[in-house]
Interface confidence: medium
Amino acid sequence: FKVATPYSLYVCPEGQNVTLTCRLLGPVDKGHDVTFYKTWYRSSRGEVQTCSERRPIRNLTFQDLHLHHGGHQAANTSHDLAQRHGLESASDHHGNFSITMRNLTLLDSGLYCCLVVEIRHHHSEHRVHGAMELQVQTGKDAPSNCVVYPSSSQDSENITAA
């Protein structure tokens, strides 16, 4: 399977909410013994590999933001910790998963990575990630709402295994 990032750039005004999205593509094993671990983290554009570095999002680690569920299940982070930081990650039945960030500040600007790991019998089988940029703007040049820029087909399809 692959991970697609429908949008490679999100430009948002300060104080706005934004939902960053990734999508699971390709054949997904839905066997009873297969689960999916999905999470989000901040990173930087490494010279060798994007998303190799894992940094917290608003002080929450990728472990705090993870979803871990069977292939046929939807899931979301309902725990207070994430919500107290204005964050919620979610996943639906169709392979979409997202992180919603509320009340954006300039400090939220940066590179965000989604990670999906296919797990069979508690062991990591395949892992892929996607990357997208968030720019939070303030002042007269800031848009009134979030503006999203679609990934090129090459960007969204050509995702490297983590």
Epitope: H66, L67, G70, Q73, H122, H123, E125
Partner: antibody
Framework: QVQLVQSGAEVKKPGASVKVSCKAS????????IHWVRQAPGQGLEWMGY????????EYNQKFKDRVTMTRDTSTSTVYMELSSLRSEDTAVYYC????????????????WGQGTLVTVSS | DIVMTQSPLSLPVTPGEPASISCRSS???????????LEWYLQKPGQSPQLLIY???NRFSGVPDRFSGSGSGTDFTLKISRVEAEDVGVYYC?????????FGQGTKLEIK
């Protein structure tokens, strides 16, 4: 420090069910899986299965599949293991253990264990 | 199911001397992802098991460096370079590569 505290000893009659609890503390409950392992008197260890506390997904050793149910209560950081249709061969100490894994959720060991719960099945 | 066979089943050792426990699996325990999930646990008398070694040769934090693990495929070994009195108990190997995960029958280490 990481602690797994299990419920007290139980005596059950054949055909009954038993529900053993395992309360976790000292770490973030939803970051780790919980496994169950049993040990019959004077015997070795036997892996029964595990549960993912964040989602409730569980996977069982086929030997116990029809009789075991693992559940969790995230509000109290507690995992439960229920074994039904008990028989004398189920007399054992039941242990819960935390499943540790790397950054890609790849299991590598059961790193912390509860103190064990003795379940005696006798008529 | 994969059968894990340990030898010897009983191991009397003089303090300060080395000890070695063998564990053989009935088929390879190299997982499809390339890792080998072979662990060693020690159960001291009257206590719960405790983790010593994971993924064949990695010592768990706090485990003395006199304990080491090695092996590949189907043959694995736990070595104690100098046995101490506190090392007594039953040692179990455990494979977590193929469900159901299985333990060896245990090796009882005792002080001579």
């Amino acid at each position: 420090q990481v602690q797994l505290v299990q419920s007290g000893a139980e005596v059950k009659k054949p055909g009954a069910s038993v529900k053993v609890s395992c309360k976790a503390s000292g770490y973030t409950f939803t970051h780790y899986t919980i496994h169950w392992v049993r040990q019959a008197p004077g015997q070795g260890l036997e892996w029964m299965g595990y549960i993912i506390p964040s989602s409730g997904y569980s996977e069982y050793n086929q030997k116990f599949k029809d009789r075991v149910t693992m559940t969790r209560d995230t509000s109290t950081s507690t995992v439960y293991m229920e074994l039904s249709s008990l028989r004398s061969e189920d007399t054992a100490v039941y242990y819960c253990a935390r499943g540790a894994y790397d950054d890609y959720y790849d299991y590598y060991a059961m790193d912390y264990w509860g103190q064990g719960t003795l379940v005696t099945v006798s008529s | 199911d994969i059968v894990m066979t340990q030898s010897p089943l009983s191991l009397p050792v003089t303090p300060g001397e080395p000890a070695s426990i063998s564990c053989r699996s009935s088929q390879t325990i190299v997982h499809s992802n390339g890792n080998t999930y072979l662990e060693w646990y020690l159960q001291k008398p009257g206590q719960s098991p405790q983790l010593l070694i994971y993924k064949v040769s990695n010592r768990f934090s706090g485990v003395p460096d006199r304990f080491s693990g090695s092996g590949s495929g189907t043959d694995f070994t736990l070595k104690i370079s100098r046995v101490e009195a506190e090392d007594v108990g039953v040692y179990y190997c455990f494979q977590a590569s193929h469900v159901p995960w299985t333990f060896g029958q245990g090796t009882k280490l005792e002080i001579k």
